[in-house]
Amino acid sequence: DSSKWNIEHPGTIYAWEGACVWVPCTYRVLDGALETFILFHNPEYNQNMSKFEGTRLYESTKDGKLPSGQKRVQFLGNKINNNCTLSIHPVHVNDSGQLGLRMVSKTEKWMERIHLNVSERPFPPRIQLPPKLQESQEVTLTCLLNFSCYGYQIQLQWLLEGVPMRQAAVTLTSLSTKSVFTRSELKFSPQWSHHGKIVTCELHDVDGKVLSEDMVQLNVKHTPKLTIEVTPNETTVRKGDSVTMTCKVNSSNPEYTTVSWLKDGIPLKEQNTLMLTLHKVTKSQSGRYCCRVSNDVGPATSEKVFLQVQYAPESSRVQISQSPAVEGSEVNFLCISPANPLPTNYTWYHNGKEVQGRTEKQFQIQKILPWHAGTYSCEAENILGIGERGPGTELDVQYPPKKVTMVIENPTPIREGDTVTLSCNYSSSNPIVNHYEWRPRGAWEEPSLGVLKIQNIGWNNTAVACAACNNWCSWASPVTLNVLYAPRGVRVRKIKPLSEIHSGNSVSLQCDFSSSHPKEVQFFWEKNGSLLGKESQLNFDSISPEDAGSYSCWVNNSIGQTASKAWTLEVLYAPRRLRVSMSQGNQVMEGKTATLICESDANPPVYSYAWFDWNNQSLPYSGRMLRLEPVKVQHSGAYWCQGTNRVGKGHSPLITLTVYYSPQTIGRR
């Protein structure tokens, strides 16, 4: 049943006597695995026997091993990967015919036929050309040979007129179940000179022997190939001479259809033959002549013939590479004066005066300067005479404003807060100055062009610069305004000790200021409105808590005085002046409450208290208040307290508490 089998192979395999064949083959069977494979040569089906008969080239065994048999026939497939590829090496003419692949599975049988065509001699390859070859259009030439075999090496070689072609060919080999072939592809740009030439594709064996070949004649379509001849030979003529030009068509495929003549690229009217005659030439007939001949491929133009009609220089004109030109740029002047032959000598004029040493068509100034501005004209000379000097061309040289300076219009000195007027001046400019710029930029008033008014000038307006601007800005050297102002940034700074101030320390305070103009200053120190000193430093040899407070310093110069922010001087000291106070008095009746309070003066405040009795025994109380409740007669005695902060300790003097009996106690007794 054919629907159960799917076998792929090229169908027909071509070879020649002594070569080999390689038959790529794959199969699929829907029902079970392939059990038996037999390769027949020209199999015939015997109806009576219900089986195929013929020469058996190969037969598989149960275990898939190859039997001894035809050595030149090799079955290269296997059952595992469904491959049925085979080869015959060498192959002979009488191998031509059908190869029958008999395939048997558990339930199905199939006979697949492959045609084998073995010729006596190597058959030629086939050259395939594109339908149209046109000059300079790259095409691919293909040489196809319906043969490929792993055991037999071949080569395809290209020749043009019997000479190997230099272009690199690409050879493709196919040994697939779809097709078996060897193909050589050659990229080729045909030239008109290739027209009618023979291209050969040769089939070579491994030793380079030519086995067969195919030849084609190239039909390269091309535009006409032209040459032009002039009579008389000389193309330099005088006005009134006659000239004949002949257009020769050396090759054309297909034949040419039209002819025309061009002068300086423009077609000449009613000139459509291969010969052009110019009678009594005039100056205007000088130019480049060529003929144009067309065929179906397209038009072709001959080389140009430069016909020169000689005449003396005409009135000159000067062409300037740039005007206006920027100062410092390169400027080229060109003297244009039609003449034939070309002028050999030029004379240049600047504002009517001859420029010495300049005798060429082009006059170059590498770096143009303001004084180069003006009118430039020239005269040209050739063997036929000197031309007329034209009217000249104007050169404008532009440059930034020159010698820009700035002037302070104010009487000096300038004080902070004054109104200052500045003017910006320059010596020359091209184009004219159209605006001014100022540095630094500020919300300043410009009452007139080039004048700047700074209202309420700041202390730090040190330097101002102006620029006069046309297309460019030229800056003046900055002018220092020298603004006078009272001292700034006044502050009190502790210079010693570096850490916190403890009672008894040596202390120095510095009166700092960031700037002052003028520089000469005086200092004043005050505390709570009282003047302390007139130096930049305020020194305490041994600071006491009484020195703590709010300090300010003043710095003054001839313009004014400036005070610092108040600076608080804090002195740290151990608890002092401790005393024990009793809110209820120092005589208390038993049974009542006795409250003792430890009073102290300390910075920072006391964080820990201790209480002691008359025997210096520590009492189990640690607060500022010692409460005895109910108080007993035995509590009578002297008490003292001790206070501690992070600077140190202090203790109070003794204070006596007297506890007397209550009337009840006295009554009981």
């Epitope: 410092g328 420029v355 010495q356 040493g357 005798t359 100034i365 770096k367 300067l369 020159k402 010698k403």
Partner: antibody, heavy 123, light 106 residues
């Protein structure tokens, strides 16, 4: 009165960078067309032009030394500078700065020269 | 680029003689040529600019001439102070200075 004066280190080691200063007076390098060149002369040899700077800060260099040279100016301080990188014993020479005055057309020449500063490069 | 070729490289002459030093440019330099004199241990000094204009203070025995590509410096009646090296220079050529001519006392 136009004067130019060169100053430099006198002695350098190979591979160091040479810094030269030309201080001038009597003219301004902001004047149109004005320029200053550096020229050197190895002992007993000819003049070798190195670099030129114009009033407009355009700079020209000797092509064979261009990669090693940097010319600059400070117009306000009337100074021109030349830096030569990676010096070698072949750079041992007297170094001159010279003024090129504004030309009529394009004919730059040197009308005033400094006295020269000597450089010795030791390996 | 224009090249400057100065000749001769050296020259011996006596006081009172006339000598000529030439400078050839590989292209037209339009008269923009200068000549310098350098004495031993001194800076070069400008003698001539624009091919033929004598610099201020230069004695009239010195003269420059030429055009296009050929230029020369002529010293009439050589004086003892004229001995030294002479250089031609065209700013736009590379290099701008000629190789120099050493003028020595014979």
């Amino acid at each position: 009165q136009v004067t130019l004066k060169e100053s430099g280190p006198g002695i350098l080691q190979s591979s160091q960078t040479l810094s030269l200063t030309c201080s001038f007076s009597g003219f301004s390098l902001s004047t149109s067309g004005m320029g200053v060149s550096w020229i050197r002369q190895p002992s007993g040899k000819g003049l070798e032009w190195l670099a030129h700077i114009y009033w407009d800060d355009d700079k020209r260099y000797n092509p064979s030394l261009k990669s090693r040279l940097t010319i600059s100016k400070d117009t306000s301080r009337n100074q021109v500078f030349l830096k030569i990188t990676s010096v070698d014993t072949a750079d041992t020479a007297t170094y001159y700065c010279a003024r090129a005055p504004p030309p009529n057309w394009d004919e730059y020449y040197f009308d005033y020269w400094g006295q020269g500063t000597t450089l010795t490069v030791s390996s | 680029d224009i090249q400057m070729t100065q000749s001769p490289a050296s020259l011996s002459a006596s006081v009172g003689e006339t000598v000529t030093i030439t400078c050839r440019a590989s292209g037209n330099i339009h008269n923009s040529l200068a000549w310098y004199q350098q004495k031993q241990g001194k800076s070069p000094q400008l003698l001539v600019h624009n091919a033929k204009t004598l610099a201020d203070g230069v004695p009239s025995r010195f003269s420059g001439s030429g055009s296009g590509t050929q230029y020369s410096l002529k010293i009439n009646s050589l004086q003892p102070e004229d001995f030294g090296s002479y250089y031609c220079q065209h700013f736009w050529s590379t290099p701008p200075f000629g190789g120099g001519t050493k003028l020595e006392i014979k």
